[in-house]
């Protein structure tokens, strides 16, 4: 399988980790989150050509069938393979609380 | 979050399990698999509108940012949440072997 740097579609076009800066307003969190005011959201973006970061056998099957009938079977999709935790300071009825979220920031990506 | 039957885009258009019939030739397996000759491949296909089968907080963030900058951040993607095992009868140097694959057939789907 191709590794993360060997993108046949051109530099940066294949599935990889991107960082998108977002405010609490952007995320719809302004009502319940105090901090951070801005989040560096890491997410998985990019195309998944044949064998590129294929997560498993299912991804390989999907590529094969996508090539036969692309209007029926989509190409594999670039999604998080794992996550980094993130702590949010939240508003509560009595004040504030610290909450850790384990499924918020992508850590690395694969195609499935 | 919306459940699997409440698709705002119209019946059957949102993320759900589909079955696609595929031959060994379609899958590129004819050289190494003896049986089955044809596979009923279950896979996750469909759109992921806001909150539809959102897998986690990351999916919700992705929806929010996709609405703000759709050319930069793609919508969440319909992918397997779990898999069903499948047994393949494979050709070997000495004859045949039975091999179970745990990551071949999607069992149910979510958006991420």
């Amino acid at each position: 399988a191709r590794n993360g740097d060997d993108c046949p579609l051109g530099p940066g076009r294949c599935c990889r980790l991107h960082t998108v800066r977002a405010s609490l307003e952007d995320l719809g969190w302004a009502d319940w989150v105090l901090s951070p005011r801005e989040v560096q959201v890491t997410m998985c973006i990019g195309a998944c050509p044949s064998q590129f970061r294929a997560a498993n056998m299912h991804a390989q099957i999907k590529t094969s069938l996508h090539r036969l009938k692309p209007d029926t079977v989509p190409a594999p999709c670039c999604v998080p393979a794992s996550y980094n935790p993130m702590v949010l300071i939240q508003k509560t009825d009595t004040g504030v609380s610290l909450q850790t979220y384990d499924d918020l920031l992508a850590k690395d990506c694969h195609c499935i | 979050a919306r459940n699997g039957d409440d698709c705002p885009l119209g019946p059957g258009r949102c993320c759900r399990l589909h079955t696609v019939r595929a031959s060994l030739e379609d899958l590129g397996w004819a050289d190494w698999v003896l049986s089955p000759r044809e596979v009923q491949v279950t896979m996750c296909i469909g759109a992921c509108p806001s909150q539809f089968r959102a897998a986690n907080m990351h999916a919700q963030i992705k929806t929010s940012l996709h609405r703000l900058k759709p050319d930069t951040v793609p919508a969440p993607c319909c992918v397997p949440a779990s898999y069903n095992p499948m047994v393949l009868i494979q050709k070997t140097d000495t004859g045949v072997s039975l091999q179970t694959y745990d990551d071949l057939l999607a069992k149910d789907c979510h958006c991420i």
């Epitope: 046949p8 579609l9 009938k69 989509p74 | -």
Partner: antibody, heavy 121, light 106 residues
Framework: QVQLQQPGAELVRPGTSVKLSCKAS????????MHWVKQRPRQGLEWIGL????????NYNQNFKGKATLTVDTSSSTAYMQLGSLTSEDSAVYYC??????????????WGQGTSVTVSS | QIVLSQSPAILSASPGEKVTMTCRAS?????MHWYQQKPGSSPKPWIY???NLASGVPARFSGSGSGTSYSLIISRVEAEDAAAYYC?????????FGGGTKLEIK
Amino acid sequence: QVQLQQPGAELVRPGTSVKLSCKASGYTFTSYWMHWVKQRPRQGLEWIGLIDPSDNYTNYNQNFKGKATLTVDTSSSTAYMQLGSLTSEDSAVYYCASYDGYSTPSAMDYWGQGTSVTVSS
Amino acid sequence: QIVLSQSPAILSASPGEKVTMTCRASSSVNYMHWYQQKPGSSPKPWIYATSNLASGVPARFSGSGSGTSYSLIISRVEAEDAAAYYCQQWSSYPPTFGGGTKLEIK
């Protein structure tokens, strides 16, 4: 801008073979699948097959298996189709057409001008 | 393979008229794509994924349909629209084209 350049015409003898070229420019050659399509005089379009230049994957219409062979030369961003054992039935215009397999559903986005093949003794 | 049947084979219309051409599939397809071809030229993508106009296509064109029946509509036909129009599917292997509708302007 994207361009697919094909020779205008080829005159070939029955029983021989011909290799048609399609030179791509204006995009990353390995990022688009390349289709080949046949059009006989005053007739419709018939899909021959495709090649993915990123890994040389090919896929042929059953009607053209054994007739057409698709290859690419990524160093020159050129796709080729060889047609063998030519007969008068192979006289047609042959188009190459690029296709973005990662923005589906989509159409065949860019087409060459076509090569007119005439099979005659 | 899926057979696409286009009707009518030849369509004659006067400038300003609304015209509709149809593409019927032998089995259900998810999307239909349309191409325009003028004599001596290569086909051009015209409508993709049933209803999306390709770049540069005038807004008087539209596409619709689902399942086995799809249409290309021109709200007010113009002289420059004279051409052959082909439908194409790739929901099933192999991709197939319809036989074409030739639009003539009176």
